[in-house]
């Protein structure tokens, strides 16, 4: 590249410059001028700028800053953003397979269960769902309820078919039965500790993605102070009032400047690291019951064997209920 | 007992869990999403460098601007870089950081907090018959009568990972039957599903 | 890659508007600068003004200025540019063009151009 | 305000011969602030030179531009076919803020 010509005469080329971000020449002095009043581009000699320039140049440094760290980050900001999404939407997929899983296993094995059983496999899903999107749910409670609500429908269509329907005073009695004989042996017990694992690790998988997005999105939109936009100022512009427009900042000045300006961001550095190693260790231990894929495609067949195992001491259990809620059954047989 | 018929019904639609070679699964797709992420461990400490090197800065050219007058490239003039009498670089630095990085510095330790907790192996301690030697084996916990057998007649146990972009594209219907998962290896110690 | 792709031809009666688009895709729009030329048929290019979104300023060269009106939609990565009271001698194909910066300051090359809206 | 006179208007020359266009400011330019651009019919220019003399990416090394003041020129070496078009110079930084010859066929 030539090297830069001698300073501008009239400050002509100054204007036409300045001119571009500031339409109106009112600011840029006709020629070359003291420059007593600058504060920035403190000059050496005479100089085409003035104070109100000078403003305008700092507003521009900090905007241009602004678009550097941008497209600094634009590639790790879309590489996190792209992943929340799609394992948000991957996680949802899962979550209506194994809905659908869990209902055919009714329909196909249990058909008299089937339409009480959906609905109560559709709002224990839903409560998966909302969890994992970081809804205030307690898992226990979400299988709980799941088991509570089964059982009066297994107990009334497969254990006892001859109960007349809908009765609800039965209904609560079984519903205390179910965890007091813990009729479902340890099952409950089992899903609850793989999904509250899975969801979990799913849950807060999916908070560190986004919380990653919230790093970049301050990390791009930061406020330099004003003694950085002094310094971008000088580094990139103070050329221009001596008619200097294609010229680059040394190399190591760049660097300096910037190391001042960033000194603040560069603190997350430390945390930054730890963020990506840690979540890499809670990647690596996302198998089996810490597995969200696995866990809940995998539940409609605990579910099944829950249920075989009522079915298998169904003959114990009517004689125990039979006397624990005959109370209810009374007042249902009048 | 109940058992799994070889083809599923559901709104007269069959399950069919179809075997797909080497796509991509939710786990490997983690797993490649980390390693893109460690390539940027160093984002904020590289960053200032990267600024420069990607604005223009004199590399090929004499003559460098160093805030107060073009001089040679390599002289003293442009490594003292025109910031003496200017501002106090090390005063700009020992300002600390602002507010908003501090709040999500803040936010950050409290992540990899829970990160290290979920990750850590005594987190990971469960009853032995919950895990590796329980329900999933079909071995038996201490009180024989909830011992749990295997998963019923016929049930052939299949472990299931969900097809990942093709379960992405895939958008099933609430009530549909499960589709377009592969089938795996049968494998003994793995969490059941259907088999095709 | 930056591309700019602008509006189809139109065929304007004299004294109303036109209005031309410019979209850009690829890069940082709001820092590019984007000028607009126009060429009459079988004559030279010709300089109408142009703007940095960033700062949403406009320049118009003295011929052009209180006729042509030239905007930026930060959102849509889109300019426009829109001329008014037009004459028979506005017929020509009319170009956007990103200008090479530094530091947001247009330097005046135009190095991406559209392909013209006729 | 400046204008740019470029001469010839027309130059006719056959392939492997060398073509060396010229550009005249009315008023002192920057040489940082002359360009060069090319345009075939129905298509947009291109810009081909920059700043006096450096070329842009993707340029063939037969282009090349030189001088300063108010005298600048356009060298193409060793003419190819596809070199046929009208060749534009551009200054910025002087009332009119961009100014374009009339152009070298």
């Known amino acids: 590249q030539p090297p830069p010509p001698p300073p501008d005469a009239t400050c002509h080329q100054v204007r036409s410059f300045f001119q571009r971000l500031q339409p109106g020449l009112k600011w840029v002095p006709e020629t070359p001028v003291p420059g007593s009043d600058l504060q920035v581009c403190l000059p050496k000699g005479p100089t085409c700028c003035s104070r109100k320039m000078e403003e305008k140049y700092q507003l521009t440094a900090r905007l241009n800053m602004e678009q550097l760290l941008q497209s600094a980050s634009m590639e790790l900001k879309f590489l996190i953003i792209q992943n929340a999404a799609v394992f948000q939407e991957a996680f949802e997929i899962v979550v209506r397979h194994a809905k659908n899983y869990t209902n055919a296993m009714f329909k196909n094995n249990y058909p008299s269960l089937t339409p009480q059983a959906f609905e109560f496999v559709g709002e224990f899903f839903t409560d998966v769902s909302l969890y994992i999107l970081g809804s205030d749910i307690n898992v226990d409670d979400m299988v709980n309820e799941l088991f509570d609500s089964l059982f009066p429908v297994i107990y009334t269509q497969l254990m006892n078919p001859g109960l007349p329907d809908s009765a609800l005073d039965i209904n609560e009695c079984l519903r205390g039965a179910r965890r007091d004989l813990k009729v479902f042996g340890n099952f409950p017990k089992l899903i609850m500790t793989q999904v509250s694992k899975s969801l979990q690790v799913t849950r807060i998988f999916l908070q560190a993605l986004n919380l990653g997005i919230e790093v970049i999105n301050t990390t791009d939109h930061l406020k330099f102070s004003k003694d950085c936009g002094r310094m971008l100022t000088r580094m990139w512009y103070c050329s221009y009032c001596q008619g200097l427009m294609m010229v680059k900042p040394c190399g190591g000045y760049c660097n300096v400047v910037m190391q001042g300006c960033m000194a603040g961001v560069v603190e997350i550095d430390k945390y930054w690291r730890e963020y990506i190693l840690s979540l890499e260790e809670l990647v690596n231990g996302m198998y089996r019951i810490y597995d969200m894929e696995n866990v809940l495609l995998g539940l409609f067949s605990t579910i099944h064997d829950s249920i075989q195992y009522v079915q298998k001491n169904a003959g114990k259990l009517t004689t125990t209920i039979g006397k624990l809620c005959a109370h209810s059954q009374q007042r249902q047989y009048r | 007992s109940a058992y799994y018929p070889e083809d599923l019904f559901i709104d007269k639609k069959v399950l069919k869990v179809a075997h797909v070679e080497h796509e991509e699964t939710l786990s490997s797709r983690r797993r490649e999403l980390i390693q893109k992420l460690k390539s940027f461990i160093s984002f904020y400490s590289a960053l200032p460098g990267y600024i420069c090197s990607h604005s223009p800065v004199a590399e090929n050219d004499t003559l460098c601007w160093n805030g107060q007058e073009l001089v040679e490239r390599y002289s003293q003039k442009a490594a003292r870089n025109g910031m003496k009498n200017q501002f106090n670089l090390h005063e700009l630095k020992m300002k600390g950081p602002e507010p908003v990085v501090s709040q999500i510095i803040d936010k950050l330790k409290h992540i990899n907090q829970l990160l290290r907790t979920m990750s850590m192996p005594k987190g990971r301690v469960l009853d032995k018959n919950l895990d590796e030697e329980g329900f999933e084996s079909g071995d038996c916990g201490d009180d024989e009568d909830e011992c749990i057998g295997g998963s019923g007649d016929g049930m052939i146990k299949v472990k299931n990972q969900l097809r990942f972009l093709a379960e992405l594209a895939y958008d099933l219907d609430v009530d549909d039957a499960p589709g377009n998962s592969q089938q795996a290896t049968p494998k003994d110690n793995e969490i059941s599903t259907f088999h095709n | 890659e930056v591309q700019l792709v602008q509006s189809g031809a139109e065929v304007k009666k004299p004294g109303s508007s036109v209005k031309v688009s410019c979209k850009a895709s690829?890069?940082?729009?709001?820092?590019?600068?984007i000028s607009w030329v126009r060429q009459a048929p079988g004559q030279g290019l010709e300089w109408m003004g142009g703007?940095?979104?960033?700062?949403?300023?406009?320049n118009y060269a003295q011929k052009f200025q209180g006729r042509v009106t030239i905007t930026a939609d930060k959102s849509t990565s889109t300019a426009y540019m829109e001329l008014s009271s037009l004459r028979s001698e506005d017929t020509a194909v009319y170009y956007c063009?990103?200008?090479?910066?530094?530091?947001?300051?247009?330097?005046?090359?135009?190095?991406?151009w559209g392909k013209g809206t006729t | 305000e400046t204008t740019l006179t470029q001469s010839p208007g027309t130059l006719s020359l056959s392939p492997g011969e060398r073509a060396t266009l010229s550009c005249r400011a009315s008023?002192?330019?920057?040489?940082?602030?002359l360009a060069w651009y090319q345009q075939k019919p129905g298509q947009a220019p291109r810009l081909l030179i920059y700043?006096?003399?450096s070329r842009t990416t993707g340029v063939p090394d037969r282009f090349s531009g030189s001088g300063s003041g108010t005298d600048f020129t356009l060298t193409i070496s060793r003419l190819e076919p596809e070199d046929s078009a009208v060749y534009y110079c551009q200054q910025y930084g002087y009332s009119p803020l961009y100014t374009f010859g009339q152009g070298t066929k």
């Open positions: 703007i940095i979104p960033i700062f949403g300023t406009a």
């Open positions: 700043a006096a003399s």
């Open positions: 063009a990103r200008e090479w910066q530094q530091q947001l300051v247009p330097l005046g090359y135009m190095d991406v």
């Open positions: 690829g890069g940082t729009f709001s820092s590019y600068a």
């Open positions: 008023h002192s330019v920057s040489s940082n602030f």
